[in-house]
């Protein structure tokens, strides 16, 4: 014999109390897939977060973060704060890059600013707390009498690009 | 979907040089950050470094710096990491890692990693 | 530069909860990434930034980190979970920025 809840689609529950006939969700609950012996509770955007995708009888709500913040997580479990750039996020707090490092992001931590000479260029533009340093020609590659931009101090490494 | 697709095996003799790469799709290749990752036989995983595919800026774990390169076709959405004087110590699974489109976060996606030997 | 300690291996039998550790100086003050990696297959993202999953990534599996050690917690544990785990870090301050901890092998008994 065929299960009659198999015939439930989703947007329903197979009604146990009902002789197994299908009900539909009741407000602010959903089914995705049929068949099932109840509906789930709709998840609710509060807080930080805001709504991305309304709840439907078929389908859970989908949040995300309110301005000035980013979603971390799968289904964007939690919220998280933004810092502006050239600053990094910390436990305690948004803070500026180091010197020799930069973000060019609202999100993550500083960078190491790339070392042009490691693949045998100069620096062409000086980084920044908000951009990574410009690597130009290789010293050699330059004509007689024309300069580049002296390094800042022991620099070490690269850094970012946008999303 | 993002997927990440390394060249084959390569065999090599001490003191050559060789060239891994990796083909990005199913994202701009230019937004993420390239990183590059080996596990030797029996070792664990080791940082190599990491190339910008927009700028091509890179940084190298300083174990490898003056034997590694980084560099990028973005025309064609590749990366490469090429080492050279090989040892046979640098017999190990080289994998390119991207990067989430932000710093301080973990590698979200890889390839499937290239077995290169260095034997005599 | 900065290190990252975890011990060789942990056993656990079917159905327990593992944990396994990943020590470093004031690593409380990093955000911490865990890897499972298997036999002749790639890296796969576990954890990120102390205790977030990606999509896909089975509720059981959960992290923390605080003072000096960061754990990574696996409950209900299944045949399928035996595989070496990774934590990393990124540390801008050294000429080695990635940070690999030495990795644990998970031993699921029986």
């Known amino acids: 014999l065929q299960d009659p809840c198999s015939n439930c689609p989703a947007g329903t529950f197979c009604d146990n109390n009902r002789n197994q006939i299908c009900s539909p969700c009741p407000p602010n609950s959903f089914s995705s897939i049929g068949g099932q012996p109840n509906c789930n509770i709709c998840r609710v955007c509060a807080g930080y977060f805001r709504f991305k995708k309304f709840c439907s009888s078929t389908s859970n709500a989908e949040c995300d973060c309110t301005p000035g913040f980013h979603c971390l997580g799968a289904g964007c479990s939690m919220c998280e704060q933004d810092c502006k750039q050239g600053q990094e996020l910390t436990k305690k707090g948004c803070k500026d890059c180091c010197f020799g490092t930069f973000n060019d992001q609202k999100r993550g931590i500083c960078r190491p600013w790339t070392n042009c000479s490691l693949d045998g260029k100069s620096v062409l533009v000086n980084g920044t707390k908000e951009r990574d340093v410009v690597c130009g020609p290789s010293p050699a590659d330059l004509s007689p009498g024309a300069s580049s931009v002296t390094p800042p101090a022991p620099a070490r490494e690269p850094g970012h690009s946008p999303q | 979907q993002v997927q990440l697709v390394q060249s084959g095996a390569e065999v090599k003799k001490p003191g050559a040089s060789v060239k891994v790469s990796c083909k990005a799709s199913?994202?701009?290749?230019?937004?993420?950050?390239m990183h590059w990752v080996r596990q030797a036989p029996g070792q664990g995983l080791e940082w190599m470094g990491w190339?910008?595919?927009?700028?091509?800026?890179?940084n190298y774990a300083q174990k490898f710096q003056g034997r590694v390169t980084m560099t990028r076709d973005t025309s064609i959405s590749t990366a490469y990491m090429e080492l050279s004087r090989l040892r046979s110590d640098d017999t190990a699974v080289y994998y390119c890692?991207?990067?989430?489109?932000?710093?301080?976060?973990?590698?979200?996606?890889w390839g499937q990693g290239t077995l290169v030997t260095v034997s005599s | 530069s900065y290190v990252l300690t975890q011990p060789p291996s942990v056993s656990v039998a079917p159905g327990e909860t593992a944990r396994i550790t990943c020590g470093g100086d004031?690593?409380?003050?990093?955000?911490v990434h865990w890897y499972q990696k298997k036999p002749d297959q790639a890296p796969v993202l576990v954890v990120y930034?102390?205790?977030y999953r990606p999509s896909g990534i089975p509720e059981r599996i959960s992290g923390s980190n605080s003072g000096n050690t960061a754990t990574l917690t696996l409950s209900r544990v299944e045949a399928g979970d035996e595989a070496d785990y990774y934590c990393?870090?990124?540390?801008?301050?050294?000429?080695?920025?990635?940070?690999f901890g030495g990795g644990t092998q998970l031993i699921i008994l029986g």
């Open positions: 890692a991207r990067e989430p489109g932000y710093y301080g976060s973990g590698l979200d996606y």
């Open positions: 199913g994202y701009t290749f230019t937004g993420y950050y």
């Open positions: 190339i910008n595919p927009n700028s091509g800026g890179t």
């Open positions: 004031d690593i409380g003050d990093k955000r």
């Open positions: 930034e102390d205790r």
């Open positions: 990393q870090v990124w540390d801008s301050s050294s000429d080695h920025p990635g940070v």
